[in-house]
């Protein structure tokens, strides 16, 4: 009989042979899983428990954000003796149980990943019936979602004294570097990266003073790709308005 020792970070430390038949509760999850936006990811989670040959009702749960209190993104329940865990909740229909909880496997597939899915996830199993017991991973698995840059907004806004400024906001992971090019700017003017608070994947670059009419192009680039978008500035000379 094999018992697995788990440290507080839930990494496998070592395996020892014991004569005792009693397992203890533990959960094995990797610290991090990486996947690209739009693709699928697998969040592995296996567990051991002290209730030999438990065949009663069970519930498998996955939470996001924080253990014990975070919102559930997936839940399924298996009746006594059943191998089938019937899905009761799948947030946005994108979470699917891959593992078989009866075989101590709660692994989850997440489909159509978005940058907003980049967070920590926690698996939990609950036994009911003859045995009432439950266990949840404390540290969880961090889902790291990567994405090629996408320019989400580009605009020209009025500034004081009849001037104009341009703003470009892009998202991506790693956060993209932004550059402006346009009339009298040269080929590419690097902009300071400024992730917006609470929006870690969004980066905004400002061109504070547009001095010439013409086409202004914002380029966003990271290790996964690049994206471009343009705005046009055309001022009606002799008037205070502008067309963009």
């Amino acid at each position: 009989f094999v018992r697995t020792k788990i440290d507080t970070t839930e990494n496998l430390l070592n395996t020892e042979v014991h004569s005792s038949p009693a397992q203890r509760w533990s959960m094995q999850v990797p610290p991090e899983v990486s996947a690209e936006a739009g693709d699928a990811a697998v969040l592995p989670c296996t567990f051991t428990h002290p209730h030999r040959h438990y065949d009663g009702p069970l519930t498998a749960i996955w939470r996001a954000g924080e253990p014990y209190a975070g919102p559930q993104v997936f839940r399924c329940a298996a009746a006594r003796g059943s191998e089938l865990c019937q899905t009761a909740l799948s947030l946005h229909g994108r979470f699917r149980l891959l593992g078989n909880p009866r075989r101590n496997d709660l692994s989850l597939r997440v489909e159509r990943l978005a940058l907003a899915d980049d967070r920590r996830y926690f698996c939990r199993v609950e036994f009911a019936g003859d045995v009432h017991d439950r266990y949840e991973s404390r540290h969880g698995v961090r889902l790291h979602v990567t994405a090629a840059p996408r320019i989400v907004n580009i605009s020209v806004l009025p500034s004081p004294a009849h001037a104009f400024r341009a703003l470009c906001t892009a998202e991506g992971e790693p956060p993209p570097a932004l550059a402006w090019s346009g009339p009298a700017l040269g080929n590419s003017l690097a902009a300071v990266r400024s992730p917006r608070e609470g929006h870690g994947h969004l980066v905004t670059a400002e061109l504070p003073a547009l001095t010439h009419d013409g086409r202004y192009t914002c380029t966003a680039a990271n290790s996964l790709g690049r994206s471009e978008a343009s705005v046009y500035l055309f001022r009606f000379h002799g008037a205070s308005g502008a067309s963009t």
């Epitope: 592995p44 799948s90 593992g99």
Partner: antibody, heavy 121, light 111 residues
């Protein structure tokens, strides 16, 4: 015992339409995704469409080669699934199988015996 | 789309001997240790039957002489001791990315 029985196949002219039906029994239909897979004469297998269950918002997925010409639907109260096909072409001639898959895996654990669709003038 | 290529196209094996079929994917079908490759058997005039799911898991009711292995892009179906009733065409299928696709199949016969 799981049973899956297809019907509705037959001879249809090019450009015509056909509705295939699949009746199931022996399992809790609501818990599973259902699919259609086809096999042209003496050829390989080609996945056609999938419809998920209520928990997964009855989401549907189609093979690109057929998208816009086929619609998959299901009736949970009748434990049945359907495939509406239109603008049929000679290359759509095949045996059409209704298959079951678990919500966690897009593999086909049970298959019907199939229904033959022949598109010919 | 992920393209699956099976080899050989056909295979003749003596009764009791080992039969090995290969399935190669155009890109990796493994995520975090889970391989989304499945194997089916189709006997003449019958519908396909699931043999192996997720590369190595034996489907319900399938004899233990069938086994699957592999990860990434290369997978193998093995029949450890061929029986007369194993004469069939074998297909692999991927569910890593939609559309789910099948390989062209391998026909297994008795030598």
């Amino acid at each position: 015992e799981v049973q899956i029985v297809e019907s509705g196949g037959g001879l249809v002219q090019p450009g015509g339409s056909l509705r295939l039906s699949c009746a199931t029994s022996g399992f809790n239909f609501n818990d599973y995704f259902m699919n259609w897979v086809r096999q042209a004469p003496e050829k390989g297998l080609e996945w056609v469409a999938q419809i998920r269950n209520k928990i997964y918002t009855y989401a549907t997925f189609y093979a690109e080669s057929l998208e816009g010409r086929v619609t998959i639907s299901r009736d949970d109260s009748e434990s049945s699934v359907y495939l509406q096909m239109s603008s049929l072409r000679a290359e759509d001639t095949a045996v059409y199988y209704c298959t079951r898959s678990l919500t966690g895996g897009d593999y086909f654990d049970y298959w019907g015996q199939g229904t033959l669709v022949t598109v010919s003038s | 789309d992920i393209v699956l290529t099976q080899s050989p196209d056909s295979l003749a094996v003596s009764l009791g001997e080992r039969a090995t079929i290969s399935c190669r994917a155009s890109q990796s079908v493994t995520i975090s240790g889970y391989s989304f490759i499945h194997w089916y058997q189709q006997k003449p005039g019958q519908q396909p039957r699931l043999l192996i799911y997720r590369a190595s898991n034996l489907a319900s009711g399938i004899p233990a002489r069938f086994s699957g292995s592999g990860s990434g892009t290369d997978f193998t179906l093995t029949i450890s001791s061929l029986q007369a009733e194993d004469v069939a065409t074998y297909f692999c299928q991927q569910s890593r990315k939609s559309p789910w696709t099948f390989a062209g199949g391998t026909k297994v016969e008795i030598k």
